[in-house]
Amino acid sequence: YHGCPSECTCSRASQVECTGARIVAVPTPLPWNAMSLQILNTHITELNESPFLNISALIALRIEKNELSRITPGAFRNLGSLRYLSLANNKLQVLPIGLFQGLDSLESLLLSSNQLLQIQPAHFSQCSNLKELQLHGNHLEYIPDGAFDHLVGLTKLNLGKNSLTHISPRVFQHLGNLQVLRLYENRLTDIPMGTFDGLVNLQELALQQNQIGLLSPGLFHNNHNLQRLYLSNNHISQLPPSVFMQLPQLNRLTLFGNSLKELSPGIFGPMPNLRELWLYDNHISSLPDNVFSNLRQLQVLILSRNQISFISPGAFNGLTELRELSLHTNALQDLDGNVFRMLANLQNISLQNNRLRQLPGNIFANVNGLMAIQLQNNQLENLPLGIFDHLGKLCELRLYDNPWRCDSDILPLRNWLLLNQPRLGTDTVPVCFSPANVRGQSLIIINVNVAVPSVHVPEVPSYPETPWYPDTPSYPDTTSVSSTTELTSPVEDYTDLTTIQVTDDRSVWGMTQAQSG
């Protein structure tokens, strides 16, 4: 197989891999028929003129995780067949002009995780066949107009994790084939109107973790093919009424971690394909009627960790496919009895960490498929008779950390809980708060030593007498579907994010396995 440097391994199928700290220069002689060359984890600090001159058949060249800080302009001369070039995870601060000249077949160029301070239009002017350009994890502060003008075939551009403070509205104007644009983790404060107008084929736009305060009303109006829009962890305080009007293909929208105070009716939609909407960690105080009515296919709605104190009875109109509703950690004191009536397919509802004092008896009347209800850490003293009677699929009910009043009125609830103990889990049981003589005792086994007027305790209580013991619980308490970990950084369906910080604060989050955003 045409000779192989001692510090490399070569396959007979034209592949070469050179790794190790003892390598300080490109090994020679490289097999002339090499198609794939990897130079990884070495101490190479520079690439001189034409080190690959004799391997013109090369298709893939990965020079990654080295000490590379300097490249001569002619380093890649004679690599006309090269289609994939990665210089990721090195120490490059400057790219010489003309470095990629002659790489007429180049389709993928990875320059991520270096220390690049700037790029110029001349850098990529020869790369007319480029499909993928990765520039994330550098120190870029601005992108000059014209930088990408020659890359008309580009489908994926990643500029995340840089130091961009502003974007020119003209910088992407010639990228009509672009499908993925990532600008996450920069310092963008606003995005000019028209910036994305030329991106008619865009499918994913990642703008999370910037400092964007305001969205222009027509910012996305030309992006009819957009499927994934990430706007989380910015400073957005309001949404212009028409900002999401032209996004019929959108199936994922993240808005968590912003400063949204209100949501106006019709702001979302029509978005017939949207399955998940993430709005946690905002400052929303109320939900008006029909605010989500355009989202007919929505399955997950996360409104936790806001300041919601009022929900209009028709706020959830139209959400007939909703499976998961998270309202925990808000300021709710009361709920209208009809507020969940339209949610016929709801399976999980999180209402913990609010100020709920009571629940209407019909609150879950039409939500027959409920499997998990989180009501812990509220101000509940009792619950209406029969509130859970019709919920045959209920396998997780959390009632602890409420000020239960254990007088004679609690008996029907106590009896029902006694018969349905498996639903309560084993982590924490509800305990009495009053009267003082029973404070801290388990509500399930409490002995109510008071005269019980017959009016309060019917011969046949409304709570079902038949115990519900599932053979195999759908949601074992150790991995409760409504108590699993929520990620603090979104998993945005791509693998360029290198780290995801995880918090396991089960008492706060109360989210499901679907909620990884």
Partner: antibody, heavy 120, light 107 residues
Framework: QVQLVQSGAEVKKPGASVEVSCKAS????????INWVRQAPGQGLEWMGW????????TYAQKFQGRVTMTRDTSTSTVYMELSSLRSEDTAVYYC?????????????WGQGTLVTVSS | DIQMTQSPSSLSASVGDRVTITCRAS??????LAWYQQKSGKAPKLLIY???SLQSGVPSRFSGSGSGTDFTLTISSLQPEDFATYYC?????????FGPGTKVDIK
């Protein structure tokens, strides 16, 4: 993201030829080789050869030399595999597969498979 | 041609079990080896390349090791979705060859 989409199932008689197509959709032609791998019912995987979609260069496994022809049409981003002089033991699912950026020969992208049945 | 053999040809295991599959090449192939998972009626899926590198998107419970002629695929804690057939493949020289497969089913 690129997908490899193959043509539909075929039923052929012994001695005939069959042509299976593999189209790159949702993106461009693979940066690497398109390989063909077959799997007889209840059996393992067998590599047949590869074609470079840009240059048209091919390498065939010795076992199929003279019976297999791999071609490509760059205008439609499609590669073709033709197998001639079919016999019953050629009944199999035929997959096209493409390598990733690390190496052309680790197949990280596969077509859905095309069942070819050879029966008299 | 380089022959690839796998053992065992089949095994029964339970969810949570640690599962090890071995692959042997008839001559040294350095680290030019891949592991694939195939479920009934589906195309194979790349799990491990270069003997030990985890393919993007594959759960970390899968790991590979070995060099030269002897290689191992390990599933640290078997999950319900892992019941499938596993193949090794040498990428060292033409023609590329696959092992005969190891079927992992439920005990």
């Amino acid at each position: 993201q690129v997908q490899l989409v193959q043509s539909g199932a075929e039923v052929k008689k012994p001695g005939a030829s069959v042509e299976v197509s593999c189209k790159a959709s949702g993106g461009t032609f693979s940066s690497y080789a398109i390989n063909w791998v077959r799997q007889a019912p209840g059996q393992g995987l067998e590599w047949m050869g590869w074609i470079d979609p840009k240059s048209g260069d091919t390498t065939y496994a010795q076992k199929f030399q003279g019976r297999v022809t791999m071609t490509r049409d760059t205008s439609t981003s499609t590669v073709y595999m033709e197998l001639s002089s079919l016999r019953s033991e050629d009944t199999a699912v035929y997959y096209c597969a493409s390598g990733g950026s690390y190496s052309p020969w680790y197949f990280d992208l596969w077509g859905q498979g095309t069942l070819v049945t050879v029966s008299s | 041609d380089i022959q690839m053999t796998q053992s065992p040809s089949s095994l029964s295991a339970s969810v949570g079990d640690r599962v090890t599959i071995t692959c042997r090449a008839s001559q040294s192939i350095s680290s030019w080896l891949a592991w694939y998972q195939q479920k009934s009626g589906k195309a194979p899926k790349l799990l491990i390349y270069a003997a030990s590198s985890l393919q993007s998107g594959v759960p970390s419970r899968f790991s590979g090791s070995g060099s030269g002629t002897d290689f191992t695929l390990t599933i640290s804690s078997l999950q319900p979705e892992d019941f499938a057939t596993y193949y090794c493949q040498q990428a060292y020289s033409f023609p590329f060859t696959f092992g005969p497969g190891t079927k992992v089913d439920i005990k």
